[in-house]
Structures are given as C-alpha cells and as structure tokens.
C-alpha cells in the first residue's frame, strides 16, 4: 500500500506505481513540457525527495476511465 511523504526507490517504487496505476501501467519519465526544458523523471522526484500520490499518478500511462 502507498505510504505518503517518503522516498521511494527500486522495487518499492515499481510496486507502488503498480499499485497506484493498476491496469493503466506506468512509465518512468514524462515528455519535457514547454514550460520546463528538462523533465525530471520519477526516480529524481520520488527516490531523492518525498513524493505524493498526485505526483505518482502523473506517471500512470493512460488516464483512468471516468464512470
């Protein structure tokens, strides 16, 4: 289960992403946006600083279907 406000690395990061994203799948980096020239990947954002559920969800592969 996801525990907020902690760093997540390695297998724990993978397992947490699988839990959060479920069937949607996930990826470890996002395309660079126009706003920031360099897009940080999830390892930078979660392994070396606290990351929350909302941030983790941005790495899920496709949006959850709304019922």
């Amino acid at each position: 289960a996801y525990r907020p406000s902690e760093t997540l690395c390695g297998g724990e990061l993978v397992d947490t992403l699988q839990f959060v994203c479920g069937d949607r799948g996930f990826y470890f980096s996002r395309p660079a946006s126009r706003v920031s020239r360099r897009s940080r990947g999830i390892v930078e954002e979660c392994c070396f600083r606290s990351c929350d559920l909302a941030l983790l969800e941005t790495y899920c592969a496709t949006p959850a279907k709304s019922e």
């Epitope: 997540l8 297998g11 724990e12």
Partner: antibody, heavy 127, light 107 residues
C-alpha cells in the same frame, strides 16, 4: 571488456582520510547507478553508498556524514571520499555497477542488481 | 531497514548433491531479491537477479524461487567450482542490505 578497477586503499590512522577511485571501462558509465560495497575481514558484505548517473546519492547510516560518493562521467570514474575514519571502517572496498539510471532498459525490462564488480581495494584503519 | 537472514550459515556437501539455501526478509520485498557467489579473495559474482532470473554465463544448475519474505537458492547438482560463500541481497528499498552469507564447504 567490461571492467572496474579500484585504487586508493591503504593504511590510515583513526580520524584520517582516504579517497578511493574506481575506473570503469567497456560500458557507458554515465547511464548507470554505481555502488560502493565493503567487506570487513572474515565478515559479510555491507552496502556503503550508491550514486545515480546524474549525481544523486544514498548512504548507509554507518557512513553518513563521513563518506562522500561522487563520480566524473567524463573520466568514467567513481570516487569515495572517506573522512573521520574509524577502526570499524577497515575492510575491502568494492565498487560495483548497479542498474540503469531509471531501473528499466529500453525494452521495459526491470533490473536492479550489482552485475559488475571491481577486484577490491583494502582499507586498514589502525594506529 | 530491511533485515535479510540467511540459513544455514554454513553447510557441508559433496559434489553431485542438491543444495538449498534460504533467505528471509524482515518485511515483504516482493520479488526484488538477488543472489551472489563469492570465492575466497575474490569479488562477489551475480548469479540470480529478481528472484529467479539467471545472470548471463551462470550455469543452469543454479535456480532461485520465492516471493514476499521467503526465498531459495538451489544448486541442483553441486560441482567442485561451486564451493564458495553465497549472499542474498534485497533491491526493494534503501538501505540496500545483504544476508549474512552461507558458506558451502566440501564434506
């Protein structure tokens, strides 16, 4: 040939400093986590520190604040600066290659282990 | 921190024997468990990663299994070159931790 070669070990007095180096060859050094692991005489393996390709670091509690891991990707070299050395730091120090920076390869395959090791360098802390 | 406990700490066996070494984690580490072999005076060598994946060049007599907290390394038919010390290591979270080792000796 994929290879890691440590240097810089030796005898140092308690409270002293030492800098270990690990020269890498045969692979794209800048893409990988790199690791220091140590082994006290007659004892098991102990993880010391890890550094990601872009320089972020992790340390064992036993060395935090005393040891600093760093790397020079342009020289394919990993370093371990050891300060305030103690008798319990006496060990063979190994550098090892860890996983790719983001753990996954281009085909989406997860890997997190130490697959390439150096031959080790002995550090003795004694007065 | 995740503690890794190996058993037995040592064992005596003969060439041709089937050998099993166990590793237990203090909390679930899913499948993120690696095994290394170390011979005296040499660096460790990766045998198996992520529980059951054989590293390139490692003989097929080595195999790994388990999940969660309990893991096993099996050598199906011990060869003279297999007499060594074996370590498990968890790759689940920092700090990365190793088991205490299992020394496989000649009977």
């Amino acid at each position: 040939e994929v290879q890691l070669l440590e240097s810089g070990g030796g005898l140092v007095q308690p409270g002293g400093s030492l800098r270990l180096s690990c020269a890498a060859s045969g692979f794209t050094f800048s893409r990988y986590w790199m690791i220091w692991v140590r082994q006290a005489p007659g004892k098991g393996l102990e993880w010391v520190s890890s550094i990601r390709s872009s320089g972020e670091t992790k340390y064992a509690d036993s060395v935090k604040g005393r040891f600093t891991i760093s790397r020079d990707n342009s020289k394919n070299t990993l370093y371990l600066q050891m300060n305030s050395l103690r008798a319990e730091d006496t060990a063979v120090y190994y550098c090892a290659r860890g996983p790719l920076s983001d753990y996954y390869d281009s085909s989406g395959y997860y890997f997190d282990a130490f697959d390439i090791w150096g031959q080790g360098t002995m550090v003795t802390v004694s007065s | 921190d995740i503690q890794m406990t190996q058993s037995p700490s040592s064992l005596s066996a003969s060439a041709g024997d089937r050998v099993t070494i166990t590793c237990r984690a203090s909390q679930s580490i899913s499948s993120y468990l690696n095994w290394y072999q170390q011979k005296p005076g040499k660096a460790p060598n990766l045998l198996i990663y992520t529980t059951s994946n054989l590293q390139g060049g490692v003989p097929s007599r080595f195999s790994g299994s388990g999940s969660g907290t309990d893991f096993t390394l099996t050598i199906s038919s011990l060869q003279p070159e297999d007499f060594a010390t074996y370590y498990c290591q968890q790759g689940y979270s920092f700090p990365l931790t190793f088991g205490g080792g299992t020394k496989v000796e000649i009977k």
